[in-house]
Amino acid sequence: IVLRPSRVHNSEENTMRALTLKDILNGTFSYKTFFPNWISGQEYLHQSADNNIVLYNIETGQSYTILSNRTMKSVNASNYGLSPDRQFVYLESDYSKLWRYSYTATYYIYDLSNGEFVRGNELPRPIQYLCWSPVGSKLAYVYQNNIYLKQRPGDPPFQITFNGRENKIFNGIPDWVYEEEMLATKYALWWSPNGKFLAYAEFNDTDIPVIAYSYYGDEQYPRTINIPYPKAGAKNPVVRIFIIDTTYPAYVGPQEVPVPAMIASSDYYFSWLTWVTDERVCLQWLKRVQNVSVLSICDFREDWQTWDCPKTQEHIEESRTGWAGGFFVSTPVFSYDAISYYKIFSDKDGYKHIHYIKDTVENAIQITSGKWEAINIFRVTQDSLFYSSNEFEEYPGRRNIYRISIGSYPPSKKCVTCHLRKERCQYYTASFSDYAKYYALVCYGPGIPISTLHDGRTDQEIKILEENKELENALKNIQLPKEEIKKLEVDEITLWYKMILPPQFDRSKKYPLLIQVYGGPCSQSVRSVFAVNWISYLASKEGMVIALVDGRGTAFQGDKLLYAVYRKLGVYEVEDQITAVRKFIEMGFIDEKRIAIWGWSYGGYVSSLALASGTGLFKCGIAVAPVSSWEYYASVYTERFMGLPTKDDNLEHYKNSTVMARAEYFRNVDYLLIHGTADDNVHFQNSAQIAKALVNAQVDFQAMWYSDQNHGLSGLSTNHLYTHMTHFLKQCFSLSD
C-alpha cells in the first residue's frame, strides 16, 4: 500500500481546505524537475529563474553566466543550444507548434567570443529543425523539407537535398506518422560521434492518402488542413536512409544505406539509427507486419565511399506471440568494442530483459532476469551498466535505477535508488554526464518530486537540485486525497490498481466511483508518481473514489499480459475494467448506483466500449477524443496490434470492435462525447461517426466539440473541458453544485 504521508491532526482540520477545480486549472500545485544540460563529464548548463544561461562546474563548485537574459530577451529567445566547442550559442524564438514533437522556429547564432550575433549568411526562417554537430560548431538544419549544412555559423549553407516538398518529400524530418508512431522525435537526422558524417531519412509521402479537415480560424472561409496520413491498411510512406560526408559533402554526395533483403521483400519501416563510431552505424528496420525487426550494422568502405551492411551483421528479433518489442522496438546500447551491444527484449519466460549480444542474437547473454522487466538502459561505461526496472518489492508501477558492474565476473548488481528516500521516491529517471562521471536523479513520486545530483563512481548524493519547497509549503493546508496501490488476482490475471480516496475516507460509507482508463497496448496507468490533478480534486472536494486499473495489454508485467490483446483490441481491456469494478463493489464502500468511467484517446475508446458493454454497471461516462474504429487510426500504430483490415487477415475484428457497432447499448447510460475539430491524431471523424450511429439508433447523448483544437485540447479549452466534465459527473452522481 502506498499512502500519502498524513500531516493532518484533528485540531488542525479546520485550517485545512479541499482542493478546488480552480487550483487544478491554474496549475497551483504543479511541480518542477531539474534536468542538467550536460556539456562535459563535470559541467552542465541550466536556465536560471531569471533566464540567464548558467554554466556549473561540479568539481570546482564554480558557476558563471555564459549568456545573459538580456541577450536572450533581445531576440525573445525561449530556448538555446551551446555548440560543443563553446564558441557559439543558437537562440530559438518564434516557436510555432506543428504536431506532437515538431515545431518551427527562428534561429539566431550568438558568437560568445565577441559577444555579437553572427551577421552574414543568416539562417532562413522558419526552420523546421536545427542542431550542432557533436564536435566543433558545424550546423545542420532543415528548411522547407530540405537539409542544409554549415561548416561554421557564418558560412554559406551547403544544400544537401533538393527534392524536399511540403506534404510530399520530407528530408531530415519525419512525416506525420513517423513522428507520432515510430520515431517519437521532430528530427530524422543523426550526426556521427565526431561529426564526420550526417545520416538522414527521406520520407516519400507522394502516394499516401490525405486527411483533410477544416480549420475555422477568424476568416470568412475556413482553411483546409491536409496531412498525408496513412490509416490502417493504406499506402505507407516510403523511407530511404542516406549518409553524407560533412567535411567534403560535394565530392560524392549522399550515399544510400542498403535495406536488409529480408526486410526489403515487402512493405517495411525504418525504426531507428544509432551511430557506433564515425565509420560504423546501426540501423533498425521493421516489417509492416510488425513482428519481425532487423538490426543491421553497417561499415564505411573508404575505397568505394559507400556503406556496407554485411548479412553477418544482421540481427533478427522476432515475436511469435505478439508484436516485436514493447511500444517500440528497443534500441541497442553499444559497448566500447564498437560491435557488441546491450538490448532489451523478451527472454524465454516472456519478460523484457537486458541481453548482451556479441555475435548472434541466438547466443545472447542474458544480463537481467526475473518476473519483472528491465525498462531502460541509461548508460554503458567501461565498467558499469545503468538501467531502470520495476523489480523492487514487486511493484510494476515503480522505477528504480540499478548499476550492474560489467567489468567484474560475475557481474554484481546494486540498486542505486531503492533506499534513498523510500517513502517519498519510488519512481525515478536519470540523466548522465559524459562517461557517467556524475548523474542527476529525478524522482517523480509518490511523494513530492525531488531532483538530486550524484557522483557516478560512489553514487553519493552531492546536492539537491530541486526539492519543490514552495509546493510542499503550499500543500500544507490542503486536504489531499489518500492514494493506495494494490492488486486484484482474477483468473490467473493480476490487475494492479490505484485508488484515490477522499481525505476523510470511511470504509463504512458508500462513495461514487469514477474509473479513469487509458488501457492502450504497452501503457501503464498505475504508477507510483505524484500528481495533483483533476481526479485529485474530485476525490478531495467532491468526495468521489477514483480508480485506475492496468488490465491486459498494459506494460511491464510480462508478455502474457502485454500480448493478450494482440489482434483483438477492444475486448480484454474492457473486460478487465469491468472485472475490477465488480471487485471494487465487493469491497463494500462503493455506491453501485453511482459508477462512472472516463478516458481520453485510447481511454475514450475503452470507456465508450465499457459503457456499451450492456453490464448495467455504469450510470454514465465520458469519452474525450476517442478512437471509434481502428480503420480510422494510423497504420503504424494500429497494424502493430491489429494486423491488416483485409479479409484474409483481421478485417472481421476491425469491424466487430467499433464503437458504432454497439450504438444500441448506449440507451441506458448517460454518455458525454467530446472531441476537438482540428485533431490531427485521432480525427474528429471518429466522434462524428459515433454521433451519427447514435442518432441513427435514436439514442440520446451529450456532446461537446472544441473548434480548432487538436488532440490535447489545450489553453482555454482545457478549463472549459474540465469544468464541463465536472458538471456532467456531479449531475450524474447527484452531487450539489
Epitope: 554549415k150 561548416q151 561554421r152 558560412d155 554559406p156 564526420k196 567535411t247 567534403y248 560535394a250
Partner: antibody, heavy 120, light 103 residues
Framework: QVQLLESGGGVVQPGRSLRLSCAAS????????MHWVRQAPGKGLEWVAV????????YYADSVKGRFTISRDNSKNTLYLQMNSLRADDTAVYYC?????????????WGQGTLVTVSA | NIQLTQSPSSLSASVGDRVTITCRAS??????LNWYQQKPGKAPKLLIS???SLQGGVPSRFSGSGSGTDFTLAISSLQPEDSATYYC?????FGQGTKLEIK
C-alpha cells in the same frame, strides 16, 4: 609566409608509376585539407584529389579513381600523390593547393607546380 | 555531378572598361562559388570566395555576385595587369575558363 613546393615530376612511360610530393611550410599543416589540381598543356584546370586535415577523408576525380592515391604525413608536413597506371592524358602540370579553410572548397594557396609527362 | 559553364570563353576589352564574366551551375550551389585568376606559366590565384568575398590583397575593382545557379565576376575598371584567364570553381569542378585580353 605560406609555401608549397611540389617535386617528383618528370617523364614516365604509359602504365608506369610516379610519386609526387608537396612540402608545406609557414602554416600548421595538420589543420588544413590539401588538394591536387592539374592542368594539361594549353587546357583548363582539373581537380584531382583531396585529403582532409587528419587523412580520414579522401576523394578523387572519376578520371583518376583507382589509379591515384593521395596521402599525407603530418609529422613531415608533406602531401603525396601516388600515380599508378599512368596514361598519356595524365600529362599535366600538377599543383598542390591548400584550402582557405575546410568547408568552402576554395584553394587559397598554391604551389608552383611540377610537370608530369607521360610518353612512350 | 555539377557542371559549371563560363561565358564568354574569351573576350577583349580596353583599359578602363567594365568587364563581366558569368558562370552558370547546372544546379543550385548556394554561394559556394570561387573565382581564380591565372597568368601564363603561373599558379592560379584566389580572387573571390563564397561568391562575393574579396580575398585580402585583391584590388577592389574586382567583385563577385550571385547565388544559386548564376554568378558573375566583374572588373569595374580594367587595368593592363588584369590580362589573364579566369576560372570559376565549385569544390571539385572548374569552369572551362575565360581568357581576357587587353585591346
Amino acid at each position: 609566409q605560406v609555401q608549397l613546393l611540389e617535386s617528383g615530376g618528370g617523364v614516365v612511360q604509359p602504365g608506369r608509376s610516379l610519386r609526387l610530393s608537396c612540402a608545406a611550410s609557414g602554416f600548421t599543416f595538420s589543420s588544413y585539407g590539401m588538394h591536387w589540381v592539374r592542368q594539361a598543356p594549353g587546357k583548363g584546370l582539373e581537380w584531382v584529389a583531396v585529403i582532409s586535415y587528419d587523412g580520414s577523408n579522401k576523394y578523387y576525380a572519376d578520371s583518376v579513381k583507382g589509379r591515384f592515391t593521395i596521402s599525407r604525413d603530418n609529422s613531415k608536413n608533406t602531401l603525396y600523390l601516388q600515380m599508378n597506371s599512368l596514361r598519356a592524358d595524365d600529362t599535366a602540370v600538377y599543383y598542390c593547393a591548400r584550402e582557405s579553410y575546410t568547408g568552402l572548397g576554395s584553394f587559397l594557396h598554391w604551389g608552383q607546380g611540377t610537370l608530369v609527362t607521360v610518353s612512350a | 555531378n555539377i557542371q559549371l559553364t563560363q561565358s564568354p570563353s574569351s573576350l577583349s576589352a580596353s583599359v578602363g572598361d567594365r568587364v563581366t564574366i558569368t558562370c552558370r551551375a547546372s544546379q543550385t550551389i548556394s554561394n559556394y562559388l570561387n573565382w581564380y585568376q591565372q597568368k601564363p606559366g603561373k599558379a592560379p590565384k584566389l580572387l573571390i570566395s563564397a561568391a562575393s568575398s574579396l580575398q585580402g590583397g585583391v584590388p577592389s575593382r574586382f567583385s563577385g555576385s550571385g547565388s544559386g545557379t548564376d554568378f558573375t565576376l566583374a572588373i569595374s575598371s580594367l587595368q593592363p595587369e588584369d590580362s589573364a584567364t579566369y576560372y570559376c570553381q565549385y569544390w571539385g569542378t572548374f569552369g572551362q575558363g575565360t581568357k581576357l585580353e587587353i585591346k
